[in-house]
């Protein structure tokens, strides 16, 4: 019997759409596969940025196969080909691997690109990104940012750029039609004539970034001699009222503290007849229901109720 | 919430300065521009000009020929808007608004601070 | 700058019927994939109001019936189905460039 061999695929590459890290590997069938016409042949693709400790690794019967990595750092990534053991008629056969790399060419030293990079989704409405300029880098330095998500055509550069001594610091951005839950890509490169300038990019989701506004209408109610509601409401905006968490900080005659995170827009408090004032703060989070990370608000303004008489069936600044 | 709150009426002489204030609260004073806009009796609206309150950085509008001063104070969350050596065609209600950038529009405003020019 | 022509000047319909106002930019207000055209609406003693922003986008609060359409330098607010309070005059606004500039506004007014 003849060893079944079988080649790795044909011009296997990474290729850059413009997209600041969302990357395209492509591939063509191996060579020699006439005698495999009736078999579907596989091909196991691994990648990752190099430094990582861990391959990614798919099987797929595509040419092709998209994902984003993280373009301060180069790519790696090998093929095979699979063929199953439905085609030779015994134990599946792999080729040999086929490599490649991918790395943008860096300009600039390290400490000239943009930093401590911030970004906050405000309120799931407004996207605002600011950073500082690199570590000596002179007032001729200019930075721009550019942006991509999936739904894009291309790359758009930022619109409305925040700016400190005439150099940007900061980006508003229009608004962004569909573009949470998937990955946001940011780049942001810089010009100088004095010397080059290194690019920093960026990955992240927008729902992660939230920071909502502060609930509204806080109000009391008397449940009973010894019981009561502090209601508010959820935020003006676009966020469901499925998406909060809320922290409250309560202050009872100005010694008692009391903080309590709950998921509703109401809170039950226990009280004495001795209580002579009482205040609450409310603010929210988005919760992992609907992101995996957030910001919280600021706090809502103060709810104050002073007075003798707690046995009020409403209680309203 | 959102409230953007202007100072109150005021009758100059021509010549004179007037300093209108624009005090915003319900939201991040610095994370939205302010717009000033004015509107003569009877007459359209036009723009005067804005500040970026996160750097101080401002665009007027050149109409205005350098007599419109736009400032603002963040930690006090207002926005100021000065113009000198009034004239009667001066006299117009002058509103202060919000926008998040261009793509945006201005999408709250002030009541409005009506200025009277007059001898 | 930018000028921008409204018309008609005034606008005579009745409650329940269909509103078409135009607004015509002397150069495109198109930039980065966007038409940076705005509508407000003004009533009398009151501080306008956006409706439209970025020429097709509805501004917090509007009511459906109101849309905006366009790019370029040619754009349309229409009111689908006209209510009492609907009746105002309304401006658009370009904020593509410096100076932003108002159209000279359309008065919608009850036939």
């Known amino acids: 019997d003849t060893e079944i061999k079988v080649n790795p695929p044909q011009d296997f590459e990474i290729v850059d759409p413009g997209y600041l890290g969302y990357l395209y590997l492509q591939w063509q069938p191996p060579l020699s596969l006439d005698h495999f016409k009736e078999c579907t042949v596989e091909y196991e693709l691994k990648y990752r940025n190099i430094g990582s400790e861990t391959w990614k690794t798919i099987i797929t019967k595509n040419l092709h196969y998209k994902d984003g990595f993280d373009l301060n750092k180069g790519i790696e990534a090998k093929i095979h080909t699979l063929l199953p053991w439905q085609c030779t008629n015994g134990s599946e056969v792999q080729s040999s691997w086929a490599e490649t790399t991918y790395w943008i060419s860096p300009q600039g030293i390290p400490e000239t690109k943009v930093q401590d990079m911030d970004c906050v989704y405000y309120n799931w409405q407004y996207l605002l990104c600011s950073w500082k300029p690199g570590i000596g880098v002179l007032l001729d330095t200019n930075y721009n940012l550019f942006y991509w998500y999936e739904g894009l055509d291309h790359a758009l550069q930022c619109v409305d750029y925040i700016k400190a001594d005439g150099q940007n610091i900061g980006c508003r951005f229009p608004y962004l039609e569909a573009s949470d839950y998937k990955d946001f890509y940011i780049c942001v490169n810089g010009s100088s004539e004095n010397k080059p300038i290194r690019s920093s990019y960026f990955t992240f989701q927008l729902q992660n970034i939230v920071k909502p506004l502060p609930p509204v209408y806080l109000t009391f109610t008397r449940e009973s001699s010894c019981e009561i509601k502090l209601k508010w409401s959820i935020p003006l905006g676009p966020i469901p009222a499925r998406c909060f968490d809320y922290e409250i900080e309560i202050r009872e005659d100005d010694t008692t503290l009391v903080t309590a995170t709950v998921e509703n827009e109401t809170y039950t408090l226990k009280t004495t007849n001795e209580t002579r004032q009482l205040c609450f703060v409310v603010r929210s989070k988005v919760n992992i229901y609907c992101s995996d990370d957030g910001i919280w608000s600021e706090w809502s303004d103060k709810q104050c109720w002073e007075g003798e008489d707690l046995s009020k069936k409403t209680l309203l600044r | 919430q959102v409230q953007l709150v202007q100072s109150g009426a005021e009758v100059k002489k021509p010549g004179a300065s007037v300093k209108v204030s624009c005090k915003a609260s319900?939201?991040?004073?610095?994370?939205?521009?302010m717009n000033w806009v004015r509107q003569a009796p009877g007459q359209g609206l036009e723009w005067m000009g804005r500040i970026d309150p996160y750097d101080g950085d401002i665009d007027y509008n050149q109409n205005f020929k350098d007599r419109v001063t736009i400032t603002r104070d963040t930690s006090a969350s207002t926005a100021y808007m000065e113009l000198s050596s009034l004239r009667s065609e001066d006299t117009a209600v002058y509103y202060c608004?919000?926008?998040?950038?261009?793509?945006?529009?201005?999408?709250?405003w002030g009541q409005g601070t009506s200025v009277t020019v007059s001898s | 700058e930018i000028v921008l022509t409204q018309s008609p000047a005034t606008l005579s319909l009745s409650p329940g019927e269909r509103a078409t106002l135009s607004c015509r930019a002397s150069e495109s207000v198109d930039n980065y994939g966007i038409s940076f055209m705005n509508w407000f609406q003004q009533k009398p003693g009151q501080a306008p109001r956006l409706l439209i922003y970025a020429a097709s986008r509805q501004g917090s609060g509007i009511p459906d019936r109101f849309s905006g359409s366009g790019s370029g330098t040619d754009f349309t607010l229409t009111i689908s189905r006209l209510e009492p309070e609907d009746f105002a005059v309304y401006y658009c606004q370009q904020s593509k460039e410096v100076p932003w500039t108002f159209g000279g506004g359309t008065k919608l007014e009850i036939k």
């Open positions: 319900g939201y991040t004073f610095s994370n939205y521009l």
């Open positions: 608004a919000r926008g998040y950038g261009t793509a945006y529009g201005v999408d709250y």
